[in-house]
Interface confidence: medium
């Protein structure tokens, strides 16, 4: 069960794995989520009743029962990891912490004009995990405007203390904002001869690379394949660093592969490993053994069991019961197998809990003005929202984002007095399919953003809470919300869909239309709409020459973009000047800017 709320003045008793320092309970929750074993945490906020040496401690905890006894304690804030949740998570943290000194190894100090410049410097420095910046009000003259870049073994501060007139923050590499080089190549027959900071077992170089990417100190790696001559080193993934940030020596060695951390790449790197490895046995601590039908079900079982990190599915005759094989659910201290054996009659793989690989990331069938007709199941998150007053008609589009939630535009509800007159139809391709007896979802509640006034001024976003839950099928399933860490991703495969007009004076289309539309920068968009303010909470899309666009009736529907093989709800059709006009792009609500609002509303008790 996903619990995102933080429990104030509450401490979880026992189950301690380790203690780190974080500037907030929110960040403690993120650290817990990325830790291989952490399920719960207790954070201590600054408080006169607490010993200052305990301020900002974040105690990561584990429990076989997935919960721990709660004890009342002032200044303690507790909560659960996001591993239990299905929404996409990100390590991206743009917060700036005022009057906090986050301590670490200060390896670089320089003058910066602002905290933002200091943060940019940290983001563009290969070793930097976080920074402290002394503002121009700082009492020490020599320290004023000084930007201290810091790193630690864990990527989190070694201590956090109160210090007036300084600010601290984290590198934004995990927000895909770094300008450092991103080297994606994996080099065969190569060993990087630099100091090892850690080593783990991995089934292939790609997994090794992803582990390196999410390890705070790893800058590059060397992986010894299963054919490596030294048996004891086979499948060993060496995580490496160097002072310069680059390998000092490359040695040609057969059956070894080397590569670089992708921490600086301008896209999100999955934390999880989805591939299944046939003929491989992953060793680790036994969590559970169950009989299931097929390796995919075994992986699903592991993903659902929150403490499971990896699994082996055995088809040995003695491990079979009817048509089911034995599914060994396992874990280890670092989330990686303790040994990897080949030539077995089994298949192994990892839990998908940190892919946040859920209904929204499931592969969709392969594959609007100037658009073309869609096929059934192509856009399974697209819904048609009907009003029954005065007569029944298509009102707006919308997107399934959860089993009880539709995301749409606020401007759709102008003049809508009550949710009772609304009907949500999902899994629809043609409007003509909707008859008197067609099943629909009633709307329990309309939640409009409280800052919404009109579409053109932004905040054009609304949630519909359905009266009943959606059972996911191939034709009706959710779309992923964009991750905050992907704010700077450049989406290149974006589509707008809807039953709206095909030209300005037209009628609602029978068949769901689709059009591929390129995103336009906000600067470019602002030039096209001089009379309006295009804010960062809006996103624009359209061809310079026009011809393809959303139009009346498409409002509230999705601007869907495919990234890393997953569809994301990047925009909500909001407004524009005419339809498909030359140099008048469509303006959409920039969903990534509202992820916190969405989560707050959909997860409120």
């Amino acid at each position: 069960e996903c619990v995102t709320q933080l429990l104030k003045d509450t401490c979880f008793e026992g189950g301690d794995i380790t203690t780190v320092f974080t500037p907030s309970a929110k960040y403690c929750q993120v650290v817990c989520t990325y830790h291989p074993r952490c399920l719960l945490f207790t954070f201590t906020a600054e408080s006169p009743s607490e010993d200052p040496t305990r301020w900002f401690t974040c105690v990561l905890k584990d429990s076989v029962t997935e919960t721990l006894p709660r004890v009342n304690r002032t200044a303690a804030i507790s909560g659960y990891s996001f591993k239990q949740c299905s929404h996409q998570i990100s390590a991206c943290n743009k917060d700036i912490y005022v009057d906090l000194d986050m301590k670490g190894i200060n390896y670089n100090s320089s003058v910066a004009k602002s905290a933002q410049e200091c943060q940019e410097r940290c983001t563009d420095d290969v070793h930097c995990h976080f920074f402290t910046y002394a503002t121009r009000q700082f009492p020490s003259l020599e320290h004023r405007n000084i930007c201290l870049l810091k790193h630690t073994q864990t990527g989190t501060p070694t201590r956090i203390t109160k210090l007036d007139k300084v600010v601290s923050g984290f590198s934004l590499k995990s927000c895909a904002l770094s300008n450092l080089a991103c080297i994606r190549d994996i080099f065969p027959n190569t060993v990087f001869a630099d100091s090892n900071i850690d080593s783990v077992m991995a089934p292939d170089a790609f997994v090794c690379g992803r582990i390196c990417t999410h390890h705070p100190g790893c800058l590059f790696f060397t992986f010894f394949s299963q054919e490596w001559p030294k048996e004891s080193q086979r499948n060993l993934c060496l995580l490496k660093t160097s002072e310069s940030g680059l390998p000092s020596t490359r040695i040609k060695k057969s059956k070894a592969l080397s590569g670089f951390s992708l921490q600086s790449c301008r896209h999100s790197i999955p934390v999880c490993h989805s591939k299944i490895y046939p003929g491989v046995d992953f060793g680790g601590e036994e969590l559970n053994v169950t009989f299931v039908k097929g390796v995919n079900v075994c992986q699903e079982t592991c993903t659902k069991m929150i403490r499971c990190q990896f699994f082996t599915y055995s088809l040995l005759p003695e491990d079979c019961k009817e048509e089911k094989g034995k599914c060994f659910l396992r874990l280890s201290m670092d989330g990686s197998p303790t040994r990897i054996a080949y030539g077995t009659q089994g298949s192994s793989g990892y839990s998908l809990r940190l892919c946040m690989d859920n209904e929204c990331t499931t592969k969709i069938k392969p594959r609007i003005v100037g658009g073309t007709a869609s096929v059934r199941g192509e856009w399974p998150w697209q819904v048609t929202l009907h009003t029954t007053s005065p007569t029944q008609r298509h009102l707006c589009g919308g997107s399934i984002i959860g089993n009880q939630w539709i995301l749409t535009a606020a401007h759709c509800f102008y003049g809508v007095e009550s949710p009772k007159i609304l009907r949500v139809y999902s899994g629809i391709l043609n409007q003509s399919e909707i008859k008197e007896d067609t099943s629909f979802f009633g709307v329990q509640e309309i939640i409009i953003h409280d800052q919404y006034k009109m579409a053109e001024s932004g905040y054009d976003i609304a949630l519909l809470k359905l009266e009943t839950t959606v059972n996911y099928t191939d034709s009706q399933r959710p779309i992923c919300l964009p991750s905050k860490g992907d704010r700077n991703v450049i989406y290149t495969d974006c589509w707008v869909t809807g039953w709206g007009y095909r030209k300005l004076r037209d009628k609602i289309q029978n068949t769901l239309q689709k059009a591929k539309i390129p995103l336009v920068t906000n600067e470019e968009c602002q030039k096209r709409y001089r009379g309006h303010k295009i804010t960062h909470k809006m996103i624009c899309a359209g061809y310079r020459e026009g011809g393809k666009d959303a139009c009346k009736g498409d409002s509230g529907g999705p601007l869907s973009c495919k990234h890393n093989e997953v569809w994301h709800l990047v925009g909500i059709t909001s407004w524009g000047e005419g339809c498909a006009q030359r140099e008048r792009p469509g303006v959409y609500t920039n969903v990534v800017e509202y992820v916190d609002w969405i989560l707050e509303k959909t997860q409120a008790v």
């Epitope: 200060n106 100090s109 003058v111 009492p139 020490s140 003259l141 020599e142 320290h143 405007n145 000084i146 201290l148 203390t161 210090l163 007036d164």
Partner: antibody, heavy 121, light 108 residues
Framework: QVQLVESGGGVVQPGRSLRLSCAAS????????MHWVRQAPGKGLEWVAI?????????YYADSVKGRFTISRDNSRDMLYLQMNSLRAEDTAVYYC?????????????WGQGTLVTVSS | DIQMTQSPSSLSASVGDRVTITCRAS??????LNWYQQKPGKAPKLLIY???SLQSGVPSRFSGSGSGTDFTLTISSLQPEDFATYYC??????????FGQGTRLEIK
Amino acid sequence: QVQLVESGGGVVQPGRSLRLSCAASGFTFSSYNMHWVRQAPGKGLEWVAIFLSYDGSNKYYADSVKGRFTISRDNSRDMLYLQMNSLRAEDTAVYYCAKSEILVVPTLDYWGQGTLVTVSS
Amino acid sequence: DIQMTQSPSSLSASVGDRVTITCRASQSISSYLNWYQQKPGKAPKLLIYAASSLQSGVPSRFSGSGSGTDFTLTISSLQPEDFATYYCQQSYSTPPITFGQGTRLEIK
């Protein structure tokens, strides 16, 4: 390695002037704040002046020397200077030039060997 | 200006002794305190920075502690080369940088 060598000290009469120099080597001189610190015979350390690296207008002085001493630097020659005017008997001291490093907090991490200034009639 | 007061002004100790020197600031200086060692006829040498961090190359028998207004420098086992004068210095509210008056450590 880092080296700071002071010169220009000597005996001078009250009211007269003297210019001290400090030659720096072994580090990127222009990137660092530089100080003058003095020590009267048998006494403790007294900070005199600082020249900040990042702002040419940022020169600061101890109250005891304000208006009489001027700190300056020539980054092209890796040199630090202290122009001392209207000297008084109480200015008699060993004058050290020191490099400042920000190791979490500002520190005087390298010092020259010092040059003695004696103000006497 | 922030005043720094060291105590004692001088002390006698023997090789192998554990020695503690204290430094008090007239107002809170967080951990913006450094310690220096000066031998006769020589320039001062940085020992400890930020109240408790050991400068590279300084023996581990030297340690510093404290925060706010009260600080200590400890030499765990006195060696012959440790007989010198020790100064504390604040760099929290500057200018001016201010030093303590010094503590002279001599052989008993």
